[in-house]
């Protein structure tokens, strides 16, 4: 009966060599995409010149194929019954799943410009970032072609500077050939309750990017969670993209592909400012942009990108206070398209489906010094590019998760 | 207070260098850059270069580049211009002056000036 | 380079009049104009930072205005203590450039 389904299932969802589980853990059997689409601003003289609201008009999707390559220096530790891990980074262009080529050309924020401003306070550096911003003939938006704005190209301005500093600029570079990790998650040996939950990530307990228990890695990384998973439960888990640890609560039941799984969703809340959910106020990191930690929908990762102003949220700034969007036209949130969903199985606690969306944004501030933003009158943060990274269990593995676990529970 | 404190008088052979110093105080070192003028009856005042003494980065005039080098030390808060190759050209008082820092204003507060005399 | 272009050279002012001092530069700097004053042997006295901003505890009879390349340096009613040099700042880009400075002495 039902003791001995638990006790199956709790003996195929431990990560070890022969378990269906470990299998696709190691290399997902689900197939990933991470769709682009990027925020082409039509007005850039009129903002630069007059400070005015940013037009923009998104384009894409443009879509990669990710996650396909297997987990790297997986290492079992038998004493604290955990498993490392190395989760290497990779992307392939699907032309047929895409609007465009990566060659296409998109006016945006010139990324360079924005975070050396923000980077480099003192007037005199800033000053001389100057110089070397004419010089370089670069502006406050530049034109790149898709494949240089996400996985990077040799910056003018940057190329100038007479001291040592990377001179390639990307919003996801380096990317190819470059892991995440390293990982430390149980493996649930000793207690199956902990399965999956990361233990270290790159050999510590906690971030260093936030305070308090906002520094926290809590949870899995969303790619399973402990078995028997109940509607009532807050999931936590850890996402390396934005920095942090966050949780998604139950909203409905769905079919898929004939299994029963429950959606669970990031809540608003998790966005909100600390005015309205408290347990938010580490990470309001800055009183001015935040607006006094008022501000809510837009986290900034700074700490996390070597000091460059990149906020993160939702796309369309989807949750977000009315001041964050309000020097943005052309935006449209709406929760269907733009939040983040998991479909989990409870009984394995796998998630069998899941689209996972998030919105990079760069702050542009005025500066005194520096000709190209001299004219700004106030603070944007400017959206960038949002993706949505989706995966959904193929049809032969359903088939076989309908008859080896639903099929027999029910 | 602010204070910064220049070396003495130099008299210099043509062709000799000569190395000056600023020794600040009542602040805090690393956070301003460091600026030196020099000052002629024909010229006025000119802008030679500046030196950062939290990461010794500088930056110069073009027309001092080759004449001039600075560099600081965050031991003893000081900083130092050395002239190279002088000609009677260089004979001038150099001042050391604060920078802006983060926020402030430019060349708010001055060493009392040293004069260098290029003679044979 | 910005060229910065001080008038006049020295200037004769009865104690209790008007002060005025120019400077042009080539080159739109917005309000990035600083002045100075200097007495003999000793260091320039910033008097008048960017924005037009009198420094504190600098006299209100001394002021600046003007903006993008033409800017006016005035001392109300000239006072003996007054005598000095005075030197005009562009702090808007790289090389900083001075102007050429006016005497101004007591008639």
């Known amino acids: 009966g039902d003791l001995l389904i638990q006790k199956t299932i709790k003996k195929q969802v431990v990560l070890e060599e022969g378990t269906i589980a470990f299998k696709n853990w190691v290399k997902t059997g689900t197939e990933v995409y991470r769709q682009f689409w990027i925020f082409d601003v039509q007005n850039p003289q009129e903002v630069m010149m007059n400070s005015s609201n940013i037009q923009v008009k998104q384009r894409g999707p443009y879509t990669y194929r990710v996650r396909f390559l297997a987990k790297e220096n997986v290492t079992q530790d038998a004493e604290d019954n955990t498993v490392s891990f190395l989760q290497p980074n990779g992307a392939i262009f699907e032309p047929s799943l895409s609007v465009g080529t990566e060659a296409d050309n998109f006016t945006v924020l010139n990324l360079a410009v924005a975070a050396a401003s923000h980077i480099y306070q003192n007037q005199f550096v800033q000053m001389i970032l100057n110089s070397l911003i004419n010089k370089s003939k670069s502006s406050m938006f530049q034109v790149r072609t898709l494949r240089e704005l996400l996985w990077g190209y040799r910056d003018p301005f940057l190329s100038l500077v007479p001291y040592p500093v990377t001179t390639t600029v990307g919003l996801f570079y380096p990317y190819n050939n470059t892991a995440d990790g390293v990982y430390k998650v149980f493996n649930g040996k000793d207690n199956i309750s902990k399965v999956a939950i990361i233990d270290t990530y790159k050999g510590k307990r906690n971030l260093s990017y936030w305070e308090s228990h906002c520094d926290m890695i809590n949870g899995t990384d969303a790619a399973s969670f402990p078995p028997f998973v109940e509607k009532s439960q807050v999931l936590q888990f850890f996402s390396s993209d934005i920095c942090r640890s966050i949780y998604a609560v139950f909203e409905s039941d769905v079919n898929l592909k004939g299994i029963p799984v429950y959606r669970f969703v990031l809540p608003s809340k998790a966005f909100a400012s600390p005015v309205e959910n408290p347990d938010n106020y580490c990470f309001c990191t800055e009183k001015i942009i935040s607006k006094n930690c008022t501000s809510y929908g837009v986290l900034d990762i700074s700490k996390c990108k070597e000091g460059r102003p990149v906020y993160i949220s939702l796309p369309h700034f989807l949750y977000a206070s009315p001041d964050v969007s309000e020097p943005i036209d052309g935006l449209n949130p709406n929760e269907e398209e733009h939040r983040t969903y998991l479909d989990i199985e409870p009984i394995t606690g796998f998630t069998l489906q899941f689209a996972k969306r998030l919105q990079v944004n760069l702050l542009v501030k005025p500066s005194e010094k520096i000709q190209v933003l001299k004219n700004l009158k106030r603070n944007y943060i400017v959206p960038i590019l949002w993706l949505n990274e989706t995966g959904t269990i193929g049809d032969e593995k359903a088939n076989m998760f309908r008859s080896q676990v639903t099929g027999k529970i029910n | 207070q602010v204070q910064l404190q220049q070396s003495g008088a130099e008299l210099v052979r043509p062709g000799a260098s000569v190395t000056l110093s600023c020794k600040a105080s009542?602040?805090?070192?690393?956070?301003?850059?460091m600026h030196w003028v020099k000052q002629t009856p024909v010229h006025g005042l000119e802008w030679i270069g500046t030196?950062?003494?939290?990461?010794?980065?500088?930056a110069f005039n073009q027309k001092f580049k080759d004449k001039a080098s600075l560099t600081a030390d965050k031991s003893s808060s000081t900083v130092y211009m050395e002239l190279r190759s002088l000609t009677s050209e260089d004979s001038a008082v150099y001042y050391c002056?604060?920078?802006?820092?983060?926020?402030?204003?430019?060349?708010?507060?001055w060493g009392q000036g040293t004069l260098v005399t290029v003679s044979a | 380079e910005t060229t910065v272009t001080q008038s006049p050279a020295s200037l004769s002012v009865a104690t209790g009049e008007k002060v005025t001092i120019r400077c042009i530069t080539s080159?739109?700097?917005?309000?990035?104009m600083n002045w100075y004053q200097q007495k003999p042997g000793e260091p320039p006295k910033l008097l008048i930072s960017?924005?037009?901003t009198l420094r504190p505890g600098v006299p209100s009879r001394f002021s600046s205005s003007g903006y993008g390349t033409d800017f006016v340096f005035t001392i109300e009613n000239m006072l003996s203590e007054d005598v000095a040099d005075y030197y005009c700042?562009?702090?808007?880009?790289?090389?900083?450039?001075f102007g050429s400075g006016t005497k101004l002495e007591i008639k």
């Open positions: 002056s604060r920078g802006y820092g983060n926020y402030g204003a430019w060349f708010a507060y």
């Open positions: 009542g602040y805090t070192f690393t956070d301003y850059e």
């Open positions: 030196v950062d003494p939290e990461t010794g980065g500088t």
């Open positions: 080159t739109d700097i917005d309000d990035d």
């Open positions: 960017e924005g037009n």
């Open positions: 700042l562009q702090s808007d880009n790289l090389p900083f450039t």
